[in-house]
């Protein structure tokens, strides 16, 4: 492409940055940007705090968190002071009727009697056929099975107590969790007399018990963590060291590593081409054609026709060709990308504190999520609890005259009903009163608050890191010119001047994300609808919004870098970043892909390394480590391995996100540097010598021959 043509393209995306003699990296004298948005954000946060206070004043999360018996009395309080645990007579009815929405709104409520108990049942037990005619006292009270509802007479027949659901028909060994007795052991329960296989209890017992192993799985897991937590921490430490090591060693091995990786990709594609050719050849000789197959929704059937392999071969061949052409014609761009990666590695080495900034982001994100969760919980429980009449078997004799779902007083249970098992149970929270009527709107406000604050925290992290790394790039004499506390000064600067700009960027992203959530919700509701046009439109919408979100994230990221450097408002920064990148689009694409490839490999290395080490250690395959390094005896050795792998992935992601931000910042600075400076004495390049060398440029030496330190 000719130089003139390139100039025309560049003009379309604005003029190159002019030289500014006062520019010395991130501007010191700044003013607040996007003040309106800052005020709006602060007002929103203030409103969010007010919502939180209102929720705290009106809500009672005890209603969700603390267990309550069928009468609505809290376990472990008042009359139930010595009975802190809640026992569900038939916990399987909870399993069958519980979903995330009902739990969020109503807590762990189940359509089964619930009683406060001093301790959870320890042994499996079922009412025997011969016990139905005995008294409650004989079957329950004398056997220390004090699990009936309060006030059940000693001399009541067991069968009638079961019909009225005053006593449980079976007990499972349970362990208290969240103040509730949850079954934990696999036991072979005797058959429940009179209960056919298609009843809830029989289904529930067989279903749940079959899914539980010989001993309490949760206890086994807990034991495994108790035995291996130290070694899991060691594995995470290894992941941390490997991530750091990888980033710091990039300055030495970035070139060969990128080359090896690209050649590796080429090799994999070449093997793919070979494999597809072999498959195609075999099927072509057999004469297996798609015309014989016809149309089928069975995708695996397409593996046995030659056209499938031919199509795959063509796609892989095209990819291979593109990659080869890129390697041949864009090698200069690849060399620049490698040099920038090395520079980023140096920057991280100079400012190690940046590697641990993700911890700050993590804590702030945790605060945002916790605040939202607590507010949502308090809001959900801000109404007066409402109770309605409910019976497990409304077809029982005597139930036909009972108005099921009419409101009732839980303290005045229908103990003398003609309908067996009639109870006054918790239904939900009333919507009377201003707060309760506005509940939905307040929850929406909370969700908006969650998204906006989360995105703002992430934006803050990006802007702070950009400020720190920009101060590294624009330090003429490295490391002397780098500020003493680059990260802290960037943090203070960002918070002080650019809260509004970050809020603006975060709000744009939030609106797109909310739109995506709404679309997902609509899609979920339309799952049953088989209209292909509707499905197609929905799919297109979702795809468009996904692309839009990706683009906005990319734009925001670069806008924040510009904000960190120049201190301009969001729109100006986003425009400048976008035009600068568009003027250098080929470099952008190459750097982006090379960085992605490298960071993907880095993650693979860290996660794979930790995974392999964990596997060999926890499965006891490493011999002769000595007593101090002996692997613990575990029930499930894969558990600490998976934990280590997931932890390693989180750690690697945290470190590499910093490194990615560093690369992006240095790249933008590099592009600015190229446009702003020309290597003359009054306009020297700030980039490293290796970058200058690749570009075939150099800085003029000062008359006193004092060389610039790099």
């Amino acid at each position: 492409m000719g130089g003139k043509q390139r100039d025309k393209d560049d003009e379309a995306y604005g003029k190159p940055v002019k030289y500014d003699p006062s520019f010395r990296g991130p501007i010191k004298n700044r003013s607040c940007t996007d003040v309106i948005c800052c005020v709006l954000f602060l007002l929103f946060i203030l409103g969010y705090i007010v919502v939180g206070i209102v929720a705290w004043l009106y809500g009672d999360p005890r209603q969700v968190l603390y267990p309550r018996n069928s009468t609505g009395a809290y376990c472990g309080m008042g009359e139930n002071k010595d009975k802190p645990y809640l026992l569900y007579f038939n916990i399987f009815s909870c399993i069958l009727s519980t979903n995330i929405i009902s739990v969020a709104e109503n807590g762990l409520q189940c359509p089964t009697p619930q009683v406060c108990v001093s301790s959870c049942p320890e042994d499996p037990w079922t009412v025997g056929k011969n016990q139905f005619s005995q008294t409650v006292g004989e079957v329950f009270y004398t056997k220390n099975r004090n699990f009936c509802l309060p006030g059940v007479p000693w001399n009541m027949m067991v069968i009638t107590s079961l019909q009225q659901e005053l006593c449980p028909s079976f007990l499972l060994p349970s362990a208290p969790a969240l103040g509730r007795c949850f079954p934990w052991t696999n036991v072979t329960l005797p058959e429940l007399p009179g209960i056919t296989n298609d009843t809830t209890i029989a289904q529930g017992i067989s279903g749940l018990i079959d899914s539980l192993n010989a001993r309490d799985i949760s206890v086994k897991i807990f034991e495994d963590f108790a035995h291996s937590w130290y070694w899991i921490l060691v594995a995470l430490g290894v992941a941390l060291l490997l991530s750091l090591l990888f980033i710091l060693l990039l300055r030495l091995v970035a070139g060969p590593l990128v080359l090896v990786l690209i050649l590796g990709v080429l090799g994999v594609l070449a093997y793919g081409i070979y494999y597809c050719w072999e498959e195609y050849r075999v099927l072509r000789d057999k004469g297996a054609s798609i015309s014989q197959l016809g149309f089928t929704t069975n995708l695996s059937a397409y593996q046995s026709v030659q056209e499938t392999w031919l199509a795959a071969l063509i796609v892989l061949a095209v990819l291979e060709a593109i990659l080869l052409l890129v390697l041949i014609f864009l090698r200069q761009r690849i060399r620049i990308a490698i040099a920038l990666l090395k520079e980023a590695s140096k920057a991280v080495g100079q400012m190690m504190s940046t590697m641990f900034y993700p911890l700050v982001t993590f804590v702030l994100l945790l605060i945002c999520i916790a605040y939202w969760a607590m507010t949502a919980l308090y809001l959900a429980t801000s109404g007066q609890p409402q109770y309605v009449l409910w019976a497990s078997n409304i077809s029982s004799p005597g139930c036909e005259k009972v108005s099921i779902n009419t409101s009732c007083n839980p303290m005045d249970q229908p103990v003398n009903s003609s309908c067996p098992g009639l109870m006054c149970v918790f239904q939900g929270y009333s919507s009377k009163g201003l707060v309760q009527r506005s509940l939905f709107n307040l929850q929406i406000y909370g969700v908006l608050g969650l998204f906006w604050t989360l995105n703002w925290v992430l934006a803050l992290g990006q802007c702070v890191l950009a400020g720190a790394f920009a101060s590294f790039y624009w330090a003429f004499h490295k490391p002397q010119d780098i500020p003493t506390f680059p990260l802290i000064s960037a943090f203070i600067r960002t918070l002080r001047y650019h809260t509004g700009s970050l809020a603006f960027g975060a709000l744009i992203l939030t609106l797109v994300q909310i739109a995506r959530v709404i679309l997902e919700y609509i899609d979920h509701k339309l799952r049953g609808v088989q209209n292909p046009v509707a499905r197609c439109i929905m799919c297109c919408f979702k795809c468009c919004l996904w692309c839009l979100e990706k683009f906005i994230k990319f734009l925001n990221r670069n806008a924040y870098i510009m904000i960190a450097i120049y201190g301009k408002n969001f729109c100006v920064s986003a425009k400048n970043a976008f035009t600068l990148l568009m003027r250098n689009i080929v470099r952008v694409v190459v750097l982006d892909k090379v960085t992605d490839l490298l960071l993907f490999f880095g993650k693979l290395l860290v996660v794979g390394g930790v995974g392999v080490l964990s596997f060999f250690f926890f499965s006891g395959r490493i011999q002769g480590l000595g007593r101090d390094f002996k692997s613990p005896h575990l029930n499930y050795y894969w558990l600490p391995i998976m934990t280590s792998i997931m932890g390693a992935y989180v750690i690697a992601s945290g470190f590499f996100s910093v490194f990615g931000m560093c690369v992006d910042t240095l790249f933008l600075c590099f592009l600015e540097d190229l446009e702003r400076n020309d290597g003359s004495l009054d306009r020297p390049y700030y980039m490293s010598k290796s970058l200058l060398k690749i570009l075939g440029k150099k800085n003029e030496a000062p008359p006193d021959n004092k060389k610039r330190k790099k």
């Epitope: 011969n130 003609s418 067996p420």
Partner: antibody, heavy 125, light 107 residues
Framework: QVQLVESGGGVVQPGRSLRLSCAAS????????MHWVRQAPGKGLEWVAV????????YYTDSVKGRFTISRDNSKNTLYLQMNSLRAEDTAVYYC??????????????????WGQGTTVTVSS | DIQMTQSPSSLSASVGDRVTITCRAS??????LAWFQQKPGKAPRSLIY???SLHSGVPSKFSGSGSGTDFTLTISSLQPEDFATYYC?????????FGPGTKVDIK
């Protein structure tokens, strides 16, 4: 058809014993609970005792506890009431009655459904 | 023990009358209440179980209602064969107990 026939009644002196029998027919005796109910002359009905289908569970009214014993022989389809230390207030017509609960139906309990014609016990010196 | 009381203890009615007998338990017995009919010199006959369900062969003129502690037996149209003594019985708490009975005779 379902039938219950009581026997063994008669005149007996206070402090003596008597054994009442109830022969069942027309149903699977071993699957049902059985009751004894009495009625003193000119008075109302009084529940005396129950024995459940397998004979394992027996319950009595307080006034006869320790003196009367309810039992059954499922092989002979017969229900018994052994009455010891009889008192004048035990004078009554004794009825046996079948309980509708068979031990198989978990969800419903109906109480007594079929009655015998009764046998008279007179305790007199 | 649970005490069962019936009211009235006796009543006089004419053929075709609607008769209502009430039974009260000293504590809640849910719906575990039965009604029996006994004619002089005869064995009792089961009419109603579970407070309101009719035994097989019992005419629909008999109906029962109530739960907890208060129950009623209603004969919608009294016939000559219905003149007898009626007993209620609770069968949920041992010992099972009968009411004292309500005698229905011809006016």
């Amino acid at each position: 058809q379902v039938q219950l026939v009581e026997s063994g009644g008669g005149v007996v002196q206070p402090g003596r014993s008597l054994r009442l029998s109830c022969a069942a027919s027309g149903f699977t005796f071993s699957s049902y609970g059985m009751h004894w109910v009495r009625q003193a002359p000119g008075k109302g009905l009084e529940w005396v005792a129950v024995i459940w289908y397998d004979g394992s569970n027996k319950y009595y009214t307080d006034s006869v506890k320790g003196r009367f014993t309810i039992s059954r022989d499922n092989s002979k389809n017969t229900l018994y009431l052994q009455m010891n230390s009889l008192r004048a207030e035990d004078t009554a017509v004794y009825y046996c009655a079948r309980d509708r609960y068979s031990g198989y139906d978990y969800f419903y309990y109906y109480g007594m459904d079929v009655w015998g014609q009764g046998t008279t016990v007179t305790v007199s010196s | 023990d649970i005490q069962m009381t019936q009211s009235p203890s006796s009543l006089s009615a004419s053929v075709g009358d609607r008769v209502t007998i009430t039974c009260r338990a000293s504590q809640g017995i849910y719906n575990y209440l039965a009604w029996f009919q006994q004619k002089p010199g005869k064995a009792p006959r089961s009419l109603i179980y579970a407070a309101s369900s009719l035994h097989s062969g019992v005419p629909s003129k008999f109906s029962g209602s109530g739960s907890g502690t208060d129950f009623t037996l209603t004969i919608s149209s009294l016939q000559p064969e219905d003149f007898a003594t009626y007993y209620c019985q609770q069968y949920t708490i041992y010992p099972f107990t009968f009411g004292p009975g309500t005698k229905v005779d011809i006016k």
